[in-house]
C-alpha cells in the first residue's frame, strides 16, 4: 500500500518533483512537493516551507490543510479551485504566511470549508468579497462556521487610507454570506471601535473573541440579537465602563459568559451601575479580578469591593471658574 494510507505516518514528496507535477491533475494519493500527507488522517501539511503559492496538486482527499509559515503574499480568486474540486476540505489554516492581500473569491469552490484561519497575516487588502465570493447583495451562504482572524492588522505604514475595522467588517458582511458563522476571532487587531451593524448580521455566533484590541466603548454596539452567544472575550481592551444598556443586553443572553479582565476601568460616578451589576451577575467570568485603573486614588481597587460612596465625580466648575 502507498505510504499515504498509514494513519500514523506522513509521506513527503521529493522537492525536485515540484515543477514537473504542478500543472498536471493530481494522482489519487499524490503529495505535493514540500508537503507531508496522511490519507488516513485526510491531512496535508505544508508548514514553514516558504511556499509562494498554494500547491496546485493537492490530493482530492484532503480534509485538513495546513499552509502555515509560508510566504504566500497574495491569495488570488479561486486559489483552491481544482478539477475535481477539493470537496472534502473542511479546515484550512493559512496563519503566519505573510499574506497581505486576499482577493474576491479566494475561497470559492470549497463546498465543505467550515474552519478558516488567516491569523498572523498583515492583511492590508482584504477584499469585501473574500468570503462571499461575489458582489451580489445576497450571496450563496458560505459553509464557514469558524473564522479566525487574530492579529491580521498590518503595520501602520502599510495600511490603506481607510479604516481597518471597516475593511474587515465589509468582508464579514458582504452578501450576508456568513449568516451561519458560529465562531469569530478578531483578537489583537488594534480595533478602536466595533461598527454597530456587524453583530446584528451574524446571528448564529456562539463565540466572539475581541480580546487585545483598543475598544474604548460598547455604547453603540448591540448584542441583543446574539441569542446563541456563549462566550464574549473583551479582555485586554481600553474599556472604561459598561453602561446600563450594554449590561441589560448581556444579562439577557441565555448562554453568555463574558470575559472582561485587564481593562482600564474608570471608577468614578459613571461606574456605579456596573459595580451594582457585577455584584449580582453570574455571567462575568473572574469578576473578582476586575480592578480600577483611574482615577489615581482608586488604582488597583477591586470593583466588587466598591460602594457608592467610593464612586464620585469631581464637580464640573461653571465656565467662569474654569482655568486653562
Amino acid at each position: 500500500s502507498s505510504p499515504t494510507s498509514s494513519a500514523s505516518s506522513f509521506s513527503s514528496s521529493a522537492p525536485f518533483l515540484a515543477s514537473a507535477v504542478s500543472a498536471q491533475p493530481p494522482l489519487p494519493d499524490q503529495c505535493p512537493a514540500l508537503c507531508e500527507c496522511s490519507e488516513a488522517a485526510r491531512t496535508v501539511k505544508c508548514v514553514n516551507r516558504n511556499l509562494t503559492e498554494v500547491p496546485t496538486d493537492l490530493p482530492a482527499y484532503v480534509r485538513n490543510l495546513f499552509l502555515t509559515g509560508n510566504q504566500l503574499a497574495v491569495l488570488p480568486a479561486g486559489a483552491f479551485a481544482r478539477r475535481p474540486p477539493l470537496a472534502e476540505l473542511a479546515a484550512l489554516n493559512l496563519s503566519g504566511s505573510r499574506l497581505d492581500e486576499v482577493r474576491a473569491g479566494a475561497f470559492e469552490h470549497l463546498p465543505s470549508l467550515r474552519q478558516l484561519d488567516l491569523s498572523h497575516n498583515p492583511l492590508a487588502d482584504l477584499s469585501p468579497f473574500a468570503f462571499s465570493g461575489s458582489n451580489a447583495s445576497v450571496s450563496a451562504p458560505s459553509p464557514l462556521v469558524e473564522l479566525i482572524l487574530n492579529h491580521i492588522v498590518p503595520p501602520e505604514d502599510e495600511r490603506q487610507n481607510r479604516s481597518f475595522e471597516g475593511m474587515v467588517v465589509a468582508a464579514l458582511l458582504a452578501g450576508r454570506a456568513l449568516q451561519g458563522l458560529r465562531r469569530l476571532e478578531l483578537a489583537s487587531n488594534h480595533f478602536l471601535y466595533l461598527p454597530r451593524d456587524v453583530l446584528a448580521q451574524l446571528p448564529s455566533l456562539r463565540h466572539l473573541d475581541l480580546s487585545n484590541n483598543s475598544l474604548v466603548s460598547l455604547t453603540y454596539v448591540s448584542f441583543r440579537n446574539l441569542t446563541h452567544l456563549e462566550s464574549l472575550h473583551l479582555e485586554d481592551n481600553a474599556l472604561k465602563v459598561l453602561h446600563n444598556g450594554t449590561l441589560a443586553e448581556l444579562q439577557g443572553l441565555p448562554h453568555i459568559r463574558v470575559f472582561l479582565d485587564n481593562n482600564p476601568w474608570v471608577c468614578d460616578c459613571h461606574m456605579a451601575d456596573m459595580v451594582t451589576w457585577l455584584k449580582e451577575t453570574e455571567v462575568v467570568q473572574g469578576k473578582d479580578r476586575l480592578t480600577c485603573a483611574y482615577p489615581e486614588k482608586m488604582r488597583n481597587r477591586v470593583l466588587l469591593e466598591l460602594n457608592s460612596a467610593d464612586l464620585d465625580c469631581d464637580p464640573i466648575l461653571p465656565p467662569s471658574l474654569q482655568t486653562s
Epitope: 446600563n244 441589560a248 444579562q251 439577557g252 443572553l253 453570574e282 467570568q285 469578576k287
Partner: antibody, heavy 122, light 111 residues
Framework: EVQLVESGGGLVQPGGSLRLSCAAS????????MSWVRQAPGKGLEWVGF??????????ENSASVKGRFTISRDNSKSSLYLQMNSLKTEDTAVYYC?????????????WGQGTLVTVSS | DIQLTQSPSSLSASVGDRVTITCRAS??????????LQWYQQKPGKAPKLLIY???NVESGVPSRFSGSGSGTDFTLTISSLQPEDIATYFC?????????FGGGTKVEIK
Amino acid sequence: EVQLVESGGGLVQPGGSLRLSCAASGFTFTDYYMSWVRQAPGKGLEWVGFIRNKGNGYTTENSASVKGRFTISRDNSKSSLYLQMNSLKTEDTAVYYCARYRGNPHYAMDYWGQGTLVTVSS
Amino acid sequence: DIQLTQSPSSLSASVGDRVTITCRASESVEFYGTSFLQWYQQKPGKAPKLLIYGASNVESGVPSRFSGSGSGTDFTLTISSLQPEDIATYFCQQSRKVPSTFGGGTKVEIK
C-alpha cells in the same frame, strides 16, 4: 447529547453520611454551573445548591436547610459532580437530581438527570 | 428568600382546552430588564423538564402550545390547547436570587 447520570443513593440511618455522584457527558463540563435539586416523596422541588464553573472559581452556594451538612464538589477530570451529605436527617429523604445550569446561570437548569433516591430512616 | 405562590394547586380540563397557571413572586425577579422565572413540567417518576426560561422564552423542542408571559412579580404559563401528554405537574422557579426557589406546583389532569 447532554447526559447526567446520578448514583450513590440508598438507605442510611439518621446521623449517617452518603455521597452522591453525577456523571456528566456531552458538553464542556468546566464551562457550566452544576446543581443539586431534591424532591421529597409526594412534595415539590427544593434547590439544594450549586457549584460555579471554572471562570468563577468553582465556588459554591447552598440552601440554608443543608448548610454546614452538605458539600457540593466536582472532579473536572472525570466530568463528575458530587454531593457529600453528612449528619443526615429523616427530612432529607428525597429523590436527588443533578442538573446543569444554562450557560447564563440566571436562566437556571436546562438539563436534569433521572434522580437517585436517598432514604434516611432508622 | 423569594417566595413563589402557584395557583391553582390542581386543575382538571378537557383535551383542547386553554389552560392557564399563575405564579406570583414575593418580590420582583427582574434583573437588568429580564425576569428570571422558569417553568418546568414533571411527569410522574420522571425528572423535571424545562419548558420556559426568562418568563417567556420557549425552550428548544417544546411544543408551541406552551407559552409564558409576565414580568416583575406576576407570571403565567399557558397551554393553548391541552393534549393528553400534558398531564403532569408544573412548577415555576425563580433564579433571580440565591437561594433559587420553586413554586408549590400545579397538577394538571384531564377531565
